[in-house]
Amino acid sequence: MMTGTIETTGNISAEKGGSIILQCHLSSTTAQVTQVNWEQQDQLLAICNADLGWHISPSFKDRVAPGPGLGLTLQSLTVNDTGEYFCIYHTYPDGTYTGRIFLEVLESSVAEHGARFQIP
């Protein structure tokens, strides 16, 4: 039975040209994490496999860095990076858990303007 839950950073925004950390955390289970995939709906960004280590897709090699931990750092963000990102935790014996993060990449001035009105 799958008892675990995935906690994610949820909806996040970042500045064009900046970087962002995509992070998920699996809790409430003792299942062993054997692989974590980071994906968009139409392509895979990276895989962290317990035996094989990290694999970064060639399409993202220049601007994706593994970590921290099982997370993923996206660099040199463009407006085209706006969209959904999925973390897929492959575990034993539970099976697969999926988390979702929505990233909005904003033009610098918009991001700065928005930041002034954020509630602490």
Epitope: D42, Q43, S59, F86
Partner: antibody, heavy 118, light 107 residues
Framework: DVQLQESGPGLVKPSQSLSLTCTVT?????????WNWIRQFPGNKLEWMGY???????NYNPSLKSRISITRDTSKNHFFLQLNSVTAEDTATYYC???????????WGQGTLVTVSA | DIVMTQSHKFMSTSVGDRVSITCKAS??????VAWYQQKPGQSPKLLIY???YRYTGVPDRFTGSGSGTDFTFTINSVQAEDLAVYYC?????????FGGGTKLEIK
């Protein structure tokens, strides 16, 4: 449990449009996942055609991009395939399928055979 | 597009035997490969995803392995009901592509 069922004409004339419907029961197509069309040619070759995601955005196989459209009717929980300017090479069994990121195509319809012939 | 090649169109085996089906990707797809079983007159059924993970309800006689470009699907102790065509598929990047299939024949 989720079920998918394809329907539409079994015979289409060359140069016309092929239109198919996928009826989904047991799950709302606006809740999650990518809802796909896949075809299988005589001789068994499988070809992914495209999808519409729960949010409404689409992605098509570049080999079909100029001819294909996938749309949906959220009130009926249906999604549709339209393939224009068909030829005999489009004769195939057409499947609708639900894809989950990281897994693949976990749920398929039973398939519907479409023959393109005058 | 990523091309998935299954070199054997047909494989013959006997009940109780172990059989392995291979699949080669035209580029590194890490572990992003799925395997499907299609029995006569039925739609394909997902057996294995991410190269080695069994989908829900799939018997443990079905296993998958491999990474990079070379993948193997194995049936330990083949049963009569395993008569089917088996396909590999890459879920690395769209357009998602399938191998040509390997038809398993039972002697």
């Amino acid at each position: 449990d989720v079920q998918l069922q394809e329907s539409g004409p079994g015979l289409v004339k060359p140069s016309q449009s092929l239109s198919l419907t996928c009826t989904v029961t047991g799950y709302s197509i606006t809740s999650d996942y990518a809802w796909n069309w896949i075809r299988q040619f005589p001789g068994n070759k499988l070809e992914w055609m495209g999808y519409i995601v729960y949010s409404g955005s689409t992605n098509y196989n570049p080999s079909l991009k100029s001819r294909i459209s996938i749309t949906r009717d959220t009130s009926k929980n249906h999604f549709f395939l339209q393939l224009n300017s068909v030829t005999a090479e489009d004769t195939a069994t057409y499947y609708c399928a639900r894809r989950q990121v990281g897994l693949g195509f976990a749920y398929w319809g039973q398939g519907t055979l479409v023959t393109v012939s005058a | 597009d990523i091309v998935m090649t299954q070199s054997h169109k047909f494989m013959s085996t006997s009940v109780g035997d172990r059989v392995s089906i291979t699949c080669k990707a035209s580029q590194d797809v890490s572990t992003a490969v799925a395997w499907y079983q299609q029995k006569p007159g039925q739609s394909p059924k997902l057996l294995i995803y991410s190269a080695s993970y069994r989908y829900t309800g799939v018997p443990d006689r079905f296993t998958g392995s491999g990474s990079g470009t070379d993948f193997t699907f194995t049936i330990n102790s083949v049963q009569a009901e395993d008569l089917a065509v088996y396909y590999c598929q890459q879920h690395y990047s769209s357009p998602w592509t399938f191998g040509g299939g390997t038809k398993l024949e039972i002697k």
